[in-house]
């Protein structure tokens, strides 16, 4: 018995392709690249039919739909345009991923242009299925910092987002009688990791042996302008802290630490990371002048609930900053060992400010990031951290602030984020 | 050198005040506490409790709280020690040391006598 | 408060002759870092005190190695191993364990 004859789905073709077909033929109906067959609402690859004995098929033949790839997957601060009407989302449709700029921006400087592709999926030439990734960008706040140009800048106010990495850092011990407080400064390196000075994250409970403060008493303020007005800024509470494990309280060598934050925070115009050094033990040159941000309240005899609350009795309410040059190492080391006292500048410190002193050498908290503007990247990196030389004796003449020299730990710092240095080094220097 | 000197010598009336200070030199003065420590005459040491130099927060033991007041003045790397309503009792020689728990280097001690 | 009791409370030596010196805690001085802050001071007559062994058993910077100390838990041992002129004086131990930290009554060391 003769089946009747077969007419191939639309953007489909049957083979095979045969004038007559006879009980017991068989036909394997397939779609062209990009479309898929259609029978009862089920998407198959084939689908085949066969000459029944009394002379009909034993399906009708399906359609061929074309490949929906359906709405592409969240990027992560990114965001998503289509490149065809109607946001179409079927095969050969073009999207592109883009970071939020210019807070992030895309690993690797992907396209982020991705085709549906004949199985369905978002495809890319680079990552293929994968989702690109939109990294922060670091050291570029939204505002322009100062030109360099002037010698010295005494404790001049801090315009909002000028130091978007700035963190205070408030510690609050409530396991002690009375509560034990204090804060320091911070520098955001990642929406979740903050770098400051070990000593600001070290119990003084002990001497003998180094202990970090328990994670629950430590609050990081990103985004804080003025003390007495928080409602701008986000807190975060801490989920790791970690001290560099050489941290040496008698001299303060290895004087860095990490603290990585409870949840990821938003980037904007006031919270942005700053970038990290390229790994070089020489660290900034001397006579280069980078910054150093503060709220000035290393002062022992305020509390955090005046910091936090009021602010009244700070030495700033607003975020100040001071500009200081890079001391070559040998002039340093000379001031302090000429002075009564076992000080050790190590090959871990540089030492920053002026031979006359003044107490504009010692604005920058605990722990806060000095940071010195790199004309390759065009970016401000930080080559140093707020360490020691002050307060007990801020301003006196000759008294360098002493800095860690971030540049020596960039490894570890990268290691301790669980970031390979390869991966995020494209956005931190180049 | 690491050094801590105390103040001289006080002879006071009962119910008078007195401070104590202890001037630290030679090392990073806001990386250790400082304790406070009270050896009565021909008696044993006592510890009256510690500051931490880095918040200014100080902690007292039971014995020493209420006319005892540990404070702080950082830009001249001193710890003081303050005794309000001074009492016969409170005759004795008053020691800093550094570090909350270290206790590893001694000031020269400062001998306060409460006599009418 | 955690009693610290010495024994004996005076100590004669001859020079050159070994001495020990006990202390004993009333509670474990082993501590949640799993650090014990027992410590040895001297107090030579009319100076101020110097710590001499921190941590149990580590010796300070400038203190002969004729000073050892030793123990855990509760009970811990200063021993002299040939005891000199200079080491006169009165001898306390100390724990940083347990809040407030507290000593030992003293024992006084001299020279027949």
């Known amino acids: 018995n003769e089946c009747p004859e077969l007419q191939p789905p639309v953007h489909g073709k049957i083979e095979p392709s045969q004038a007559k077909y006879f009980f017991k033929d068989q036909v394997l109906v397939s779609c062209d690249t990009g479309y898929k067959v259609l029978k009862d609402n089920v998407e198959m690859d084939t689908f085949q039919i066969e000459c029944l004995k009394d002379g009909t098929w034993s399906n009708k033949i399906p359609t061929c739909k074309i490949v929906d790839c359906r709405a592409p997957g969240e990027l992560e601060h990114g965001l998503i345009t289509f490149s065809t009407r109607n946001n179409l989302t079927t095969y050969k449709s073009e999207i592109k991923y883009s970071c939020q700029e210019p807070y992030y921006k895309m690993l690797n400087n992907n396209t982020g242009i991705y085709t549906c592709s004949a199985q369905g999926v978002w495809m890319n030439k680079v990552l293929g299925r994968s989702l690109p990734t939109c990294l922060p960008e670091c050291g570029q706040p939204s505002r322009s910092l100062p030109s360099l140009v002037k010698r010295i800048i005494g404790g001049r106010n801090a315009e909002p987002g000028l130091f978007p990495w700035q963190a205070l850092i408030v510690v609050e011990d409530t396991s002690r009688v009375p509560n034990d407080k204090w804060f320091g400064s911070g520098a955001l390196l990642s929406a979740s990791w903050i770098l400051t000075a070990a000593h600001v994250l070290r119990s003084q409970r002990r001497d003998t042996t180094v202990i970090p403060v328990s994670k629950e008493h430590v609050t990081v303020y990103l985004g804080l302008h003025d003390v007495r007005d928080k409602s701008g800024a986000v807190n975060s509470s801490a989920a790791r802290v970690v001290l560099h494990p050489d941290f040496n309280i008698q001299n303060y060598n290895h004087d860095i630490a990490l603290v990585q934050l409870q949840e990821p925070v938003p980037l904007g115009p006031h919270v942005m990371p700053v970038c990290l050094p390229r790994l070089e033990p020489e660290g900034p040159a001397p006579h280069m002048l980078g910054l150093v941000a503060g709220w000035g309240i290393s002062n022992p005899n305020v509390t955090v609930d005046e910091i936090i609350s009021s602010g009244t009795r700070t030495l700033s309410d607003v975020l100040q900053y001071v500009k200081l040059p890079v001391v070559p190492h040998a002039e340093c080391k000379t001031s302090y060992e000429s002075r009564s006292g076992n000080y050790s500048v190590t090959e871990n410190m540089f030492c920053a400010g002026y031979y006359e002193g003044g107490k504009d050498t010692c604005l920058g908290d605990s722990g806060g990031a000095f940071v010195i503007f790199d004309d390759l990247s065009q970016r401000w990196v930080v080559q140093g951290l707020v360490s020691w030389g002050g307060p007990e004796e801020c301003g006196s003449k000759q008294v360098y602030g002493v800095y860690t020299k971030v540049s020596n730990y960039v490894d570890w710092v990268w290691e301790q984020m669980g970031l390979p240095q390869s991966v995020v080094e494209p956005q931190v220097e180049r | 050198q690491i050094q801590l000197v105390q103040s001289g010598s006080e002879l006071k009336k009962p119910g008078a005040s007195v401070k104590v200070s202890c001037k630290a030199s030679g090392y990073i003065f806001t990386s250790y506490g400082m304790s406070w420590v009270r050896q009565a005459p021909g008696k044993g040491l006592k510890w009256m409790g510690w500051?931490?130099?880095?918040?200014?927060?100080?902690t007292y033991a039971d014995d020493f709280k209420g006319r005892f007041v540990f404070s702080l003045d950082t830009s001249v790397r001193t710890p003081y020690l303050q005794i309000s309503s001074l009492k016969a009792e409170d005759t004795a020689v008053y020691f800093c040391a550094r570090g909350g728990e270290a206790m590893d280097y001694w000031g020269q001690g400062t001998l306060v006598t409460v006599s009418s | 408060d955690v009693l610290m009791t010495q024994t004996p409370l005076s100590l004669s030596v001859t020079p050159g002759q070994p001495a020990s010196i006990s202390c004993k805690s009333s509670?474990?001085?082993?501590?949640?870092?799993?650090?014990?802050?027992l410590n040895w001071l001297l107090q030579r007559p009319g100076q101020s005190p110097k710590r001499l062994i921190y941590?149990?058993?580590k010796l300070d910077s400038g203190v002969p190695d004729r000073f050892s100390g030793s123990g855990s838990g509760t009970d811990f041992t200063l021993k002299i191993s040939r005891v000199e002129a200079e080491d006169v004086g009165v001898y306390y131990c100390?724990?940083?364990?347990?809040?407030?930290?507290?000593f030992g009554q003293g024992t006084k060391v001299e020279i027949k």
């Open positions: 941590l149990v058993s």
């Open positions: 500051i931490n130099t880095y918040s200014g927060v100080p």
């Open positions: 509670q474990s001085l082993l501590d949640s870092d799993a650090k014990t802050y």
């Open positions: 100390w724990q940083g364990t347990h809040f407030p930290w507290t």
